[in-house]
Structure formats: structure tokens, C-alpha cells
Amino acid sequence: ANSLLEETKQGNLERECIEELCNKEEAREVFENDPETDYFYPKYLVCLRSFQTGLFTAARQSTNAYPDLRSCVNAIPDQCSPLPCNEDGYMSCKDGKASFTCTCKPGWQGEKCEFDINECKDPSNINGGCSQICDNTPGSYHCSCKNGFVMLSNKKDCKDVDECSLKPSICGTAVCKNIPGDFECECPEGYRYNLKSKSCEDIDECSENMCAQLCVNYPGGYTCYCDGKKGFKLAQDQKSCEVVSVCLPLNLDTKYELLYLAEQFAGVVLYLKFRLPEISRFSAEFDFRTYDSEGVILYAESIDHSAWLLIALRGGKIEVQLKNEHTSKITTGGDVINNGLWNMVSVEELEHSISIKIAKEAVMDINKPGPLFKPENGLLETKVYFAGFPRKVESELIKPINPRLDGCIRSWNLMKQGASGIKEIIQEKQNKHCLVTVEKGSYYPGSGIAQFHIDYNNVSSAEGWHVNVTLNIRPSTGTGVMLALVSGNNTVPFAVSLVDSTSEKSQDILLSVENTVIYRIQALSLCSDQQSHLEFRVNRNNLELSTPLKIETISHEDLQRQLAVLDKAMKAKVATYLGGLPDVPFSATPVNAFYNGCMEVNINGVQLDLDEAISKHNDIRAHSCPSVWKKTKNS
């Protein structure tokens, strides 16, 4: 019925508008509706204009695709001509009243079927039903597999290929591990697979700048080191370096009015020369403070070295030695004054004696037959040395003495000349200034070491050697080497070190043989204003330790092997170092930073006196330790 209607309409159109010309009302009668008439009539007029007599040639040259008026007019009502739908995507085109409808093939959408439906993004069929890759194509889609997989017969699912089974030699000497879609050639940690040689090669991590400062590569690994001597330690990431930080601040205030007598480990701290009228007599007044028991305070001599006077400390008491053409004497007396308090000392040459007073009270009177120093040419010329004497004097002393004295003097008045000129000299030199407050002990400032020669061999014992160490420590930084035994070949067969613990505000103590930690005492609160007492006993068979928290004998699988290394070193010659290490490689020990803080050391029952060391860094204080810095209200 519908096609009959169309045929009737076509006949009417032919009769009314092609065989004859029609106006809009006549056209309305053909279509019997406004939308089609409104669509048809302007296009009908275009056809008429194109095919009027005389314009045919021009029309043929124009864009009009129709050969004659009939074709031109007949095509107007057909919305599907020319085809408005996308050829690839449409199934059919339906002509409507001044409109068209494109019916799309599956996989296409849009008014003209111009858009491909992305089946891969269909929420009702996730990923197009593909197990791996969904490839959208115009009007369709297909599934594919990733590398290392094969497609199953259902054309949707993928199966892994086991390359290790297919080619057993695929990894050479490395281990082949099959993984989904691929395989891996596995090497032990610290090794990298070489595709060319099909083998595992050591990774040189050091060439990859893994470490901030020093790096040591070894097969299968690497270790980072930091320059402890410059105040660095290894950070927790075991790669970067950080400054060894202060955990217990000390009061390091000094005053230039206080002369430090232990500025040099060996040598005089100050030398003065006096030229006075011949009637002058020797006199020295000063306040003196020390915890040291022995050492030279002052040495005075005549210009020709023929007469001399030594004011020293022995056993904590004042000792005077003198020698001139008339006499040679040594006297010790008075109370013990190495008590850390300021003591006023005066030594005055009287007509027939030398008077020594402490706190203005006479403690010694030494008779003398004549003047101490002989004047020449009407002048008394005297040389005065503080905290030492010229080297040649050592052999002339009535009784030998260790000249090193860790102490301070203030308010000095020599030869009744006051402090004339001395303060100005001291003021310029910071290292001649004394600490304002000190306590008993030895202080390691974190910049140097002391060396001792100790014989650890015990002939009477079956063990052959033993090291019994007692440490009383009050560290100021949480990292540093406290004690080390160093072999001639620059290895460190035994060391006791301090390291900051991973747990906050506590420290670990490491016992190491060469660069291996044999024992770690964890999380001790050592950075406090109280001293901590530690004891270690080691021989070729055993290692015992005692800390504030426990006493134990250490034994583990590897210990005997490490003790054997130590035993071998101890049978040769070892040097003992306190406060750090000499110039050994960074990698010689787990810790290489200098110890910073107070420490007193007893080895095999002998209290070590830093004044007796073979060598000692000038900044180490043998018998004085700075006080803990106390926060005041206005600081």
C-alpha cells in the first residue's frame, strides 16, 4: 500500500511539475504535507533555473549532476539520494518526510552511522571479552595477546609460554625463572646478568656513585664509608654521610686570663726573659688549678744555664728542684693540690732561703747559701719557662720528672713585674686559653688520638695474651672509636667503638675484629652527664663483657674464627690507640670517627696516663674534662 502511494505521488509530480511548471500550491497538492513541500520547492526552483532553455551548456558545467530536468526534479524528494549515510557503517537508508534514517550495521553508531562503536569499552562486556589486549577496529574488534603469550582457540584467552622449559640454555650459567609473558635470568644479589656472555657478573656499585664519600666494591656487594676523621659517619641508608652530631654539649668556654699549661704534648707553653737590676731576687706568684699529679709548672734559669730552679708537681704536691754553684736540692711538701681547685702558690727567694707558700701559708722553706741566680754586669738576667724546660735540662734534673702537666695558672706575677706583656701574648692565641670549668678525667675532643705501647703477652697464662679493658666514659658525640689495637700491616685486629643507635637518643657499643662487628651492645643511654662503666676481657678463646645493664660471655659460630684472626695479630706486635685510629684505610674498621668526650682507660690493671703516651694529639686533655653545658635561664 505504501509503494502504491509513492507511485501515485511520483506520477502526480511528473504531471504537475515536470511536464508543466507548478507553483508552491500545486506542489502542496502533490505532497499533501508542509515539511516535504517546504523542502521540495526551493530545490525545484534551482532545477528549473539550471535547465531553462539556453542555460543547458552552463548548467552542464556547473556542479549539477543531473542530465535533464526530469532527473533533477525526481531526485529532490529522495532524502537518501545522494547517500547521506557513512558507506562503511550503514546497512540501509530510509527516506522520510524531508528527512532520512540511516540504519547502522553492528559496531557502528551516529545519525549517519559515522562512528565506530568501541567494543573494547563496552561496560557490559569488559575489554570486549578479551583476556589481554582488545583492539578496536572500524565496525569490529579483535583480541590479541601480549608478548610471551599465545592465543587459545577461543580467540579471546591467552596462555603463558614457558621459555625456561622450551629453551633450557636460554640463561647460560644464570638461573632461568619463568614469569607471566616472559622469563628472567636471575643472578645472586650484587651480580648482574650479562646478555652477551649469558653469565652473572659482579656489579661495580662504586662506579655507579652509590656512596657519598668512599666506596669499596667486592664480589657481590659493596660498602660505603665516610671520613670519620673529618667528622662524618655513615647515615642509616648506608650510602650517604652525615655529620657526627653532638649528643651531650660541653661547656668549652675559655678565658684568656687563664693560661693553659698543656697546650703542647711536648714543649714549653710560654717563655719569658727578664733583665732586672742586680738587687732583684727570683719571685713567682700565681693561682694554679689541676687534676694532674705530676708535671712541670715553671722552670727558671740563669742566662748561662749555670743555675736553675724547677717548680713542679709530684704526687699532687709541690716539688722544688734547684741547682747553682753553691747547692743542689730537691724538696717536696705541702698538701696535695691536684684537687681541681684554684690554689694560690708563691715561690719567693729570700736572703737565705726560698719560701714556698700555698694559700699564703708557708709549706716549705729551702735554705740556700747565696743568691739563686748570679747577677752579671749589674743586671740579673733570668729565663722563665712555663709547663716545660729545654730538652738538655732533662738529664741535669736531680730527680727525673714527666714534664707534661694538664693544668691552668692565673693571676701570675713573675719577678714582681706583674703580668707585664704576658696577657697580650696569650690573648692572641686561643689554644693557650684555659677552660673556665673542668672536671676530673681525660678529654678527647674528636680530633686526634693517643698512642701507647702495651705488652699484652702474659707468660704465666696458658692463653698467651689477654686484654682486660675498663672504660669510664662520658661521650659527647654518639659515634667514635674509643680503643683500637693496630697491627703493623695497618689492620685493626680489635676495636671498641661507639655508634649512634637506630633507636633515638641511645648508642650501641661495637666490638670489632678488622672490619667485622663481632658483637653489638644495643641501645645504651651513654650520652648523659653520668659516666658509664664498661669492661671487656678478651683472650684467644673468650670474649666477656660487662656493661651497666649486663655481664655476659659472648659465643657465636663466627666468634672463634674472628678470635683466631685476633690471636694471630696479638702474637705479632700491636700498637694501642685511644680516641680513634691512625692512618689506616677507611675500610679497616666499621667505625673510623674520632671519639669525642671524656674517657678514662684501664688496661690489664694499669690506669693509663695520657702524659705517659708515646704520642698524643695536643688537643687531648690528659687530666681535665670540660663540664656538661648547663642551660641557664637567659641562655
Epitope: 551516529g110 545519525e111 565506530d116
Partner: antibody
């Protein structure tokens, strides 16, 4: 990475024909599913879709411009072109070429645009 | 006169969220899921930010999201950043098989 670059005269006289070419690099103009489009932006910042073409030659035009516009494709040079006849000052705009996705009227890659001024 | 209506300008402070609306008719925005959003920094090529109303192309931050209700589509930008300052255009397919754009909204990050 697909890149598009417009080229052509920046000044066209009224009633003459505006001709622009878009060169595609980093991808083929014959890639399945992609249509190649022209869009313009008037000085007042409004965007206007002109039309698009498939490499086979199928074209879709904005009905308001259909009588004046022709988009063609040159597959060998990896280019497509725009011709707009009988231009007026109202056709002054920044003309962009762009790639249209197969799955919708979405333009995922655009050229930088070229300003065409219609003036005598 | 653009077929789709957008506010001329929107603004927000860094870290805030803003929404740009795009209103059309049942013949465009309301009739299809073919709605997209473009970001345009002046002097640069426009960039497709959202398609199919709410889908994001790869490489576009998840701070950008799209939605639609009736004849109005919306673009929301959360955690606003200085680099988001640009012109934003919405676009829709129409019943007459054409593509129409909004007039553009200038986003200012205060």
C-alpha cells in the same frame, strides 16, 4: 606522537577562495578509523566545526558551510586541505586542523592554528 | 552565538574545586552521550580532556571529571592548580550529524 601543522596565506581578499593545507607527521593519514578535520575559532573565541574527511574521500560538512566548502585529502604527501569559496570578513578566524577519533566526534590531536584575515 | 551555553568566566583558589556548566538541548547534549571538553591555553593547541561525557584520555589528570544531567553537562576540576588556568570548551554531537561547541569559559586561578 602525531603532529599537525596548518599552512596557507594569512590574508585573503573578500569574494576570493581561502585555501589551507594541514601536514600530518608522526602517523599516517590512512590509519584506520581516523577522520581529519577543520575547525575555526572566531576572534570572539567561539569554535565552529567546518567538517571532516576520511582518507577514502568520504566527507562530512557543517550544513551552514556546505555550499562553500571542500575538504580533500592527499595521501601521498600525508596532507589534507580546506577550500572555502566566496569568503567575507565573517570568515576571519584562527583555522585549526585536527584528528577525529573513530569512536566519536572527538578531536584528540590539534594543530597550533593559523590566523586567516579576510580583508581588502 | 554558540549553540552550547557556558559561563564566560569562572575562578577559584589553588586547592579548591570548580565546576563549569554547558547547557544545550535535547537535540545535542541531552540526546547523546557524545559530550567532550577541551582545554585551551592561548597560543597553544587545544587539548581533549574528557570524552563520552565522563571518560578521560590517558595522560589527563584524575582531577578532571565530567558528568551530565538532562541537557546540561559539567566539567569539575578538583585540587585547582596554577597550570589549570585556561579556556575550557564543551562540545556535543547533534541530531543533524554536526559538532557544536560552547562559547568557552575562562578559568582564572586566584
Amino acid at each position: 606522537q602525531v603532529q599537525l601543522q596548518e599552512s596557507g596565506p594569512g590574508l585573503v581578499k573578500p569574494s576570493q577562495t581561502l585555501s589551507l593545507t594541514c601536514t600530518v607527521s608522526g602517523g599516517s593519514i590512512t590509519s584506520d578509523g581516523y577522520h581529519w578535520s577543520w575547525i575555526r575559532q572566531y576572534p570572539g573565541k567561539g569554535l565552529d566545526w567546518i567538517g571532516y574527511i576520511y582518507y577514502t574521500g568520504n566527507t562530512y560538512y557543517n550544513p551552514s558551510l556546505k555550499s562553500r566548502v571542500t575538504i580533500s585529502v592527499g595521501t601521498s604527501q600525508n596532507q589534507f586541505s580546506l577550500k572555502l569559496i566566496s569568503v567575507t570578513a565573517a570568515d576571519t578566524a584562527v583555522y585549526y586542523c585536527a584528528r577525529r577519533l573513530s569512536t566519536g566526534p572527538y578531536f584528540d590531536y590539534w594543530g597550533q592554528g593559523t590566523l586567516v584575515t579576510v580583508s581588502s | 552565538q554558540s549553540a552550547l551555553t557556558q559561563p564566560a568566566s569562572v575562578s577559584g583558589s589553588p586547592g579548591q574545586s570548580i565546576t563549569i556548566s554547558c547547557t544545550g538541548t535535547s537535540s545535542d547534549v541531552g540526546g547523546y552521550e557524545f559530550v567532550s571538553w577541551y582545554q585551551h591555553h592561548p597560543g597553544k593547541a587545544p587539548k581533549l580532556m574528557i570524552y563520552d561525557v565522563s571518560s578521560r584520555p590517558s595522560g589527563v589528570s584524575n582531577r578532571f571529571s565530567g558528568s551530565k544531567s538532562g541537557n546540561t553537562a559539567s566539567l569539575t576540576i578538583s585540587g585547582l592548580q596554577a597550570e589549570d588556568e585556561a579556556d575550557y570548551y564543551c562540545s556535543s554531537y547533534t541530531r543533524s550529524s554536526t559538532v557544536v561547541f560552547g562559547g568557552g569559559a575562562r578559568l582564572t586561578v586566584l
